[in-house]
Amino acid sequence: EVEKTACPSGKKAREIDESLIFYKKWELEACVDAALLATQMDRVNAIPFTYEQLDVLKHKLDELYPQGYPESVIQHLGYLFLKMSPEDIRKWNVTSLETLKALLEVNKGHEMSPQVATLIDRFVKGRGQLDKDTLDTLTAFYPGYLCSLSPEELSSVPPSSIWAVRPQDLDTCDPRQLDVLYPKARLAFQNMNGSEYFVKIQSFLGGAPTEDLKALSQQNVSMDLATFMKLRTDAVLPLTVAEVQKLLGPHVEGLKAEERHRPVRDWILRQRQDDLDTLGLGLQGGIPNGYLVLDLSMQEALS
């Protein structure tokens, strides 16, 4: 807590300017009017205040706005934003995308901090859903943002926002998240033609069911191995050797290198060795010829 001391004669700040950097902590407290600071917040960013001085300026704003800062001040916080705690930010009501952008800019190039996570949370909750403009902005600053959301939070993403998603935005998504995003992507891109559709949907295929993979296998898509390896194991298992061959096209040769890894390993175990041999890749571990395969999952579903 800064002690209340009288401002020395002639040191009362008439405006927020560079001369203030030479003020001691107590002089800033005594000589800078909080209302003046609030109206000239945009200047603070252009003045090389020390950490200690920024603490005093924050303290003055906290006293002026105990219930939380107004958006007019928040928009111009600049580097002072980095002094805010998540508790401070929870008091804010940020509605403007410009304000959000201004504050994200301050944190640019750094990991998503608890402050930024709280700010985004407040902003999205205030909007009611993650609209396209917001998603555009957030993924531009934090490519991994989408994958930091829970499946429940992702369910509020409208399909129209999916157009803003780039492949790298999904790099850290797990299958549960892709399960939510895939149907939205399918809906968003449904009017595109075959090859264009595949280019757009490819990053989301980790959430695709078997029937959609079967459909893709009929379209000469030539899926690469990296995409295939990210498919849901339960979606890959029912595919026939012929379907996988059509799905991968020239990339089918890559199965050999991945035969010990999921989902390829599990898929091999479900195929007849005869069928695997038709690929000419030397894949081993299929069901020996003459063995009968019972689909117990179908039986369980009926009983």
Partner: antibody, heavy 120, light 107 residues
Framework: QVQLVQSGAEVKKPGASVKVSCKAS????????LHWVRQAPGQGLEWMGI????????SMAQKFQGRVSMTTDTSTGTVYLDLGRLGSDDTAVYYC?????????????WGNGTTVTVSS | DIRMTQSPSSLSASVGDRVTVTCQAS??????LNWYQQKPGKAPQLLIY???DLETGVPSRFSGRGSGRDFTLTISSLQPEDFATYYC?????????FGGGTKLEIK
Amino acid sequence: QVQLVQSGAEVKKPGASVKVSCKASGFTFIGYYLHWVRQAPGQGLEWMGIINPSGGRTSMAQKFQGRVSMTTDTSTGTVYLDLGRLGSDDTAVYYCARADNWNAGSMDVWGNGTTVTVSS
Amino acid sequence: DIRMTQSPSSLSASVGDRVTVTCQASEDINNSLNWYQQKPGKAPQLLIYDASDLETGVPSRFSGRGSGRDFTLTISSLQPEDFATYYCQQLNSYPLTFGGGTKLEIK
């Protein structure tokens, strides 16, 4: 590659003035401050002042006020230090150094230095 | 102005030695302290900021500690390239001030 390249050595007579330049490359001025620090032969480091290159606003250590000016040319990414009424105790290596907006006192990139010799 | 006092002013040591340099501020500066290394004829280089954070690219044998008025820079195992002069700097208030330097020489 982020660097600050300074102008060459200067020899001046007492009472004259000198202008030292510092050109930034590999980063934009926006988001950074530039400091000037000097070092007399065999001595330590002395902070002279700071400039915000984006707007050209400056703050100077008291002992240099009135005798030093710092300016900026954003079109070429160059800042200048003007030192007037030179005396023999101004003989030193003059460095410019960069600091980011958030940690304005922390100088993470330094220029190569400009030697200024004041001699009659 | 805040005065920064460094000790020792010079120090002789051998490769492999553990070396500690101290810096004392004339008043409380929290953790607003940097350490710089300067080799003859070269510009200083930032080693440590905010008292203990290692600047990118600086070897982990360098470490900084302290808060308030007393600070230390430690080199855990001296390498030939570490022989140089080391300066502390406070950035708690203006004017920014530096310590007088510690010259580290080969024994």
